[in-house]
C-alpha cells in the first residue's frame, strides 16, 4: 500500500446514481468531448440531472491503466469549419477572434497588474514585520535561520528584488557580511516560487488542469529546495559560492552600467499607480535597525519633493564625531557640530486611490490583497477560457507542436537548453519571474504547455531574474556596487548550481517527478494544495526561525531527529518499491501505522466535515454570485443549485447514505452551456468540484 | 542692566549640604544657559556645572557629579546648585554665570559676584 | 579632558607696553577659546570670545589670535585698569576647562 493510498468512491457503487457511468471514465475533460453524451458502447445516454451531493463523483473515479492523467489533452475544434461558413460567418469570426485576442491582452494585463498590486498588498500587511526579521543580526548568522528569513520575508513582501535590495544595503553598510547573504539569498529564491504556486490554486475548478497547474507551479519549489537541500551544506562547509564571487569579481573589472529595460513596468506603472503607491525605503530602514521607521507608513503620500540642504546644529557623543574641529564646539552641556542636513518639502501628492485614507497599512493591506486575489482569480479563469476556445483544432496543435516537440535526433538534448535560454529570456524582458511562471501557470493547466517543458522555462526564469539582479547591481551606485553585484553573482551561480545538478541527468530530473506526485495527490485532495503552501513556505520556516531563536542546540536537537526520521521514511519508502523481499512483512507497506499517519482519507473526512458546515452558511451566497455571474456572461442556461435548502432534509428526501457533505457542490459550477451549439463552455471555467474537497 | 546675584553660600560641615540660589534680572532668563563656575582661594576658575534654556540637559564636571544637582526655575528667574555630601575641597568662591543660548559656545559673557561656601569642621 | 596651559604664569610690565600672552591647548580646539580678566575680589569678565572676536565695551586694545592649539592675548599698548590675571577658556568640548592663569603686574 502506497504513503497515500487512492482515494475511494463516496459510495460503492456511484452507477446506481450516475447513468452511464457504468464503464471507466475517460480522463479527457468534459469540455474536451463532443456535444452529444454517449456511454462507453457508444450508445447515447439519457441527459440527467445529477443531484447535487454527487454532481462530483465522477471526477473521483480513478483515471484507468491506459489513461495517463499526465498525457496532454486533445484541444479539439468543435466549431463550425472555416470552409463551411458564409462571408458574413467569416467577417464575424475575424472579428471575433480579434476581440478574443484584445480581451486575452487585457486580461493578461489586469493578470500582471494584480500581482503586482499583490505584491504591494503582502508589503503593506508583513512588510514591516519582514524588516525586523532582518534587523535581528545575531541569528542570521546561523545558515539555517538566514535561509528560512530568506523564506519568510519573501512571502511576507512577494518580492525576491524587495528582499535582495534589503540584503545588499545590509552587505554595503557592513550590517551583515556575504557570508551571512547567501543562504539569505537562497531562501529569496525559495520564496519567490510561491507566486505562481497561488496562482496554480486558481486553478482548482478542473482536476486535471489543477493537477498539470500545480505541479507545473510545484517544479520551481522543488527545484529551489531540492537545490538548497544540496547547496545549502555544500556552501556552509566550503563556501564556494563566496570565494567563486569573489574570484569572478577580482578577474574581472567592473564598471557601473545601466539598469535592465524595465519594459513591463513601463506598461503596467501607469495603472498600478493609480491603486497604491509604496515607500519601499521604509522596510529597508526597519532592516537597518532604525528604530523611527517602525512608526513609518509604508504608504507613499507625497510622490513630488524638494530637498533642501541646510547647515544645522547637531549633538555629538563627543569631538571625535564632529565633522572637522573647526566646527566642533561645546555650550557647556552637550558637543555641538555643524552638519549637512536635507530637508524635504512637500510638492504634490501622489495620485493613487488611499492617498487621502488614514487608514493604517495593515487595513489597506488587506483591502488590496482582498481585491487583487479576486482580480487575479478572475483574471486566470478568463484567460483559461479565451485560451481554451482560442487554443483549438489546427492553431492548438501548431502551438503545442512548437513548444513541446523536442529538436530531430541527435539534437534532441539541446532542446532543453533552448528552452532555458527562452526562459531566462522571457524573465529579462517583463523583469519578474514571478510573471513569467505565473503567467505560464494557466498554459500548463489548460495543457498547451507540457510539465517537461515548462521545467526547463522556470530554470531559465530563475537564471532570468538573477541576470535582471546583475544588471541592477551594476547600475548601483559606488558605495554597493561591489557588495550588490557579489550578491547577484551568488544568486546566479547558485541557480546555475542548482540546473547543474537537477537538469542535465534525466534521471536526476527529480523535481518533476516530485511535482507530479504532488500534482496528483492535490488533484484528488485540493485542500493539501493549501496546506503544502501553508506548511512548506509559513509554518516550517517559522518553526526554523523560532528553534533558531532558541539557539544552535535546541535547533539541532529537534532538527535531528525529524530529518533522521524524513530520511528512514524515504529509505523505507525506496525498499518498499525496489526490493520488498528484504524487508520483513510488516514492512513491506505502510498498514502497521495508523491509517491516519499514512493515508490522506482521514485528514480529508476531517477537512470535508469542517467544510460541511461552512457550506451550510455560505451555499446561499454561493447561489446568489452563481446567478450574478451567470448574468454577467451571458450563459442562459446555467444552473444555480437549491443549496439553500438544509442539507439534512435533501438527504431525506433522496434517501441516499452520504458518508461527508464536502465542499462547494454547486451544480451550476458543473452545468455547461452551448456556445452557439458549436464548442461547450463552463460557466467561470469552473467544473463540478469534488466532493471532498475543500475548495 | 543685566544682574546675577548669588546667595546662601556659608559655612558647612564636611558631608553637609547647601543650596545656592543665583537671582537673574536684565535679560530674557528662559532664553540662554546658565552655569555654576567656582574659585577655589588663591587658585584658578574651575567650571562645576551648566544647565539648558528649558532645565531639560544639565552637565556635572566629574568631581561633583552625584553630589551636586542644578535646577532652574525660568518662571521666577532662578538658578539653583543643591551641593551635597560637601568635601572640604569644595571651599571656593561660587560664581554663577550666564551663557549664550542653547547650541551656541560656551562664553561665560556675565558673572554675579559670587557666595562663598566654606566647609571645614 | 583638555588641559590648557599659560604661560608665563605671571608678568611685569609697564604702562604703554605691549604685552603678550599665549594659552596652549592639550589637543586641537579650532577658534573654540575665550580670553577673561579678573582683578581681585570681583568676578571675570570675558574679554574675548571664539579666539579673536571681541566682546562689545572691550577696548579695542586688546587682541586675540590663533587657532588649533596656539593662542594668543596681545595687548597692545598697557593701560593701568588692565593689571588683573588673565583666563583662557575652551569651548571645544565638556568639560569646559580654563588655564591657570597669568598674572599681570605693573613693574
Known amino acids: 500500500m502506497a504513503p497515500w493510498p487512492e482515494l475511494e468512491n463516496a459510495h460503492p457503487n456511484p452507477n446506481k446514481f450516475i447513468e452511464g457511468a457504468s464503464g471507466p471514465q475517460s480522463s479527457i475533460p468534459d469540455k474536451d468531448k463532443g456535444t452529444s453524451k454517449t456511454n462507453d458502447s457508444g450508445t447515447p445516454v439519457a441527459k440527467i440531472e445529477l443531484l447535487p451531493s454527487y454532481s462530483a463523483l465522477v471526477l473521483i473515479e480513478e483515471p484507468p491503466e491506459g489513461n495517463d492523467p499526465w498525457d496532454l489533452p486533445e484541444l479539439q475544434d468543435n466549431g463550425i469549419k472555416w470552409s463551411e461558413r458564409d462571408s458574413k460567418g467569416k467577417i464575424l469570426c475575424i472579428f471575433q477572434g480579434i476581440g478574443k485576442f484584445i480581451l486575452l491582452l487585457g486580461f493578461l494585463y489586469l493578470f500582471v497588474c494584480s500581482l503586482d498590486v499583490l505584491s504591494s498588498a503582502f508589503q503593506l500587511v508583513g512588510g514591516k514585520m519582514a524588516g525586523q526579521f532582518f534587523s535581528n543580526n545575531s541569528i542570521m548568522s546561523n545558515p539555517v535561520a538566514g535561509l528560512v528569513i530568506g523564506v519568510l520575508v519573501t512571502v511576507m513582501v512577494q518580492s525576491s528584488s524587495t528582499s535582495s535590495s534589503i540584503i545588499v544595503s545590509m552587505v554595503a553598510s557592513s550590517l551583515l557580511s556575504v557570508r551571512a547573504a547567501i543562504p539569505i539569498i537562497m531562501g529569496a529564491n525559495i520564496g519567490t516560487s510561491i507566486t505562481n504556486t497561488i496562482v496554480a490554486l486558481m486553478q482548482a475548478g478542473d482536476r486535471n488542469e489543477f493537477r498539470r497547474a500545480f505541479a507545473g507551479a510545484t517544479v520551481h519549489d522543488f527545484f529551489n529546495w531540492l537545490s538548497v537541500l544540496v547547496l545549502l551544506p555544500l556552501e556552509a562547509a566550503t563556501h564556494y559560492l563566496e570565494k567563486l564571487t569573489n574570484l569572478v569579481l577580482e578577474t574581472f573589472s567592473f564598471q557601473n552600467g545601466e539598469d535592465a529595460p524595465d519594459i513591463l513596468k513601463v506598461i503596467t506603472d501607469p495603472f498600478t499607480k493609480l491603486i497604491i503607491q509604496l515607500d519601499k525605503k521604509v522596510i529597508q530602514q526597519i532592516a537597518m535597525g532604525d528604530s523611527e521607521a517602525q512608526n513609518k507608513s509604508l504608504i507613499k503620500i507625497w510622490c513630488k519633493t524638494i530637498s533642501n540642504v541646510i547647515e544645522e546644529n547637531v549633538t555629538v557623543p563627543s569631538p571625535d564625531n564632529c565633522t572637522s574641529p573647526s566646527y566642533c564646539w561645546t555650550d557647556g552641556i552637550q558637543t555641538w557640530t555643524i552638519q549637512n542636513v536635507t530637508e524635504k518639502e512637500n510638492i504634490a501628492k501622489c495620485q493613487h486611490i488611499f492617498v487621502n485614507f488614514s487608514l493604517p497599512d495593515l487595513a489597506v493591506g488587506i483591502i488590496l490583497l482582498t481585491v487583487s486575489l479576486l482580480i487575479l482569480c478572475g483574471c486566470l479563469i478568463m484567460i483559461v477560457k479565451l485560451l481554451g476556445s482560442v487554443l483549438r483544432g489546427q492553431v492548438a496543435t501548431v502551438i503545442k507542436k512548437t513548444l513541446n516537440t523536442d529538436f530531430p535526433f541527435p539534437f534532441a538534448w539541446l532542446t532543453g537548453y533552448l528552452a532555458i535560454l527562452v526562459g531566462a529570456g522571457m524573465t529579462f524582458i517583463v523583469q519578474s519571474s514571478s510573471v513569467f511562471t505565473s503567467a505560464m501557470t494557466p498554459l500548463i493547466g489548460i495543457g498547451v504547455i507540457s510539465i517537461e517543458r515548462a521545467y526547463p522555462l522556470t530554470l531559465g526564469s530563475n537564471i532570468g531574474t538573477t541576470t535582471t539582479a546583475i544588471l541592477a547591481a551594476l547600475a548601483s551606485p559606488g558605495n554597493t556596487l561591489r557588495s550588490s553585484l557579489q550578491i547577484a553573482l551568488c544568486h546566479f551561480f547558485f541557480n546555475i548550481s542548482g540546473i547543474l545538478l537537477w537538469y542535465p541527468i534525466p534521471f536526476t530530473r527529480l523535481p518533476i517527478r516530485l511535482a507530479k506526485g504532488l500534482g496528483n495527490i492535490s488533484a484528488k485532495y485540493r485542500w493539501f494544495a493549501v496546506f503544502y503552501l501553508i506548511f512548506f513556505f509559513l509554518l516550517t520556516p517559522l518553526t526554523v526561525f523560532g528553534l533558531s531563536l532558541a539557539g544552535w542546540p535546541v535547533l539541532v536537537g529537534v532538527g535531528v531527529p525529524i530529518i533522521l526520521l524524513i530520511l528512514l521514511v524515504l529509505c523505507l519508502r525506496m525498499l518498499q518499491a525496489r526490493c520488498p523481499r528484504i524487508l520483513p512483512l510488516k514492512l513491506r507497506d505502510w498498514n502497521f501505522l495508523p491509517l491516519w499517519m499514512h493515508s490522506l482519507k482521514p485528514w480529508d473526512n476531517i477537512i470535508s466535515l469542517a467544510t460541511s458546515c461552512f457550506q451550510r452558511r455560505c451555499c446561499c451566497c454561493c447561489r446568489v454570485c452563481c446567478r450574478v455571474c451567470c448574468m454577467v456572461c451571458g450563459c442562459k442556461c446555467c444552473r444555480c443549485s437549491k443549496c439553500c435548502k438544509n442539507l439534512e432534509e435533501e438527504e431525506k428526501e433522496q434517501d441516499v447514505p452520504v458518508k461527508a457533505s464536502g465542499g462547494f457542490d454547486n451544480t451550476a459550477m458543473s452545468k455547461e452551456c452551448q456556445d452557439e451549439g458549436k464548442g461547450q463552455v463552463e460557466v467561470l471555467g469552473m467544473k463540478a468540484l469534488s466532493n471532498t474537497t475543500v475548495f | 542692566e543685566v544682574q546675577l546675584v548669588e546667595s546662601g553660600g556659608g559655612w558647612v560641615q564636611p558631608g553637609g549640604s547647601l543650596r545656592l540660589s543665583c537671582a537673574a534680572s536684565g535679560f530674557t532668563f528662559s532664553s540662554h544657559i546658565m552655569y555654576w563656575v567656582r574659585q577655589a582661594p588663591g587658585k584658578g576658575l574651575e567650571y562645576v556645572s551648566g544647565?539648558?534654556?528649558?532645565?531639560?540637559?544639565?552637565y556635572y564636571v566629574d568631581s561633583v557629579k552625584g553630589r551636586f544637582t542644578i535646577s532652574r526655575d525660568n518662571s521666577k528667574n532662578l538658578l539653583y546648585v543643591h551641593m551635597g555630601s560637601l568635601k572640604p575641597e569644595d571651599m571656593a568662591m561660587y560664581y554663577c554665570?550666564?551663557?549664550?543660548?542653547?547650541?551656541?559656545?560656551?562664553?561665560?559673557?556675565?558673572w554675579g559676584q559670587g557666595t562663598l561656601v566654606t566647609v571645614s569642621s | 579632558d583638555i588641559q590648557m596651559t599659560q604661560s608665563p604664569s605671571s608678568l611685569s610690565a609697564s604702562i604703554g607696553d605691549r604685552v603678550t600672552i599665549t594659552c596652549r591647548a592639550s589637543q586641537s580646539i579650532g577658534t573654540f577659546l575665550n580670553w577673561y580678566q579678573q582683578k581681585p575680589g570681583k568676578a571675570p569678565k570675558v574679554l574675548i570670545y571664539v579666539a579673536s572676536s571681541l566682546q562689545s565695551g572691550v577696548p579695542s586694545r586688546f587682541i586675540g589670535s590663533g587657532s588649533g592649539t596656539d593662542f594668543t592675548l596681545t595687548i597692545s599698548s598697557l593701560q593701568p585698569e588692565d593689571f588683573a590675571t588673565y583666563y583662557c577658556?575652551?569651548?571645544?568640548?565638556?568639560?569646559?576647562?580654563f588655564g591657570q592663569g597669568t598674572r599681570l603686574e605693573i613693574k
Open positions: 544647565i539648558s534654556s528649558n532645565g531639560l540637559s544639565s
Open positions: 554665570a550666564r551663557g549664550g543660548r542653547d547650541r551656541v559656545p560656551a562664553v561665560f559673557d556675565y
Open positions: 577658556q575652551q569651548s571645544y568640548s565638556v568639560p569646559i576647562t
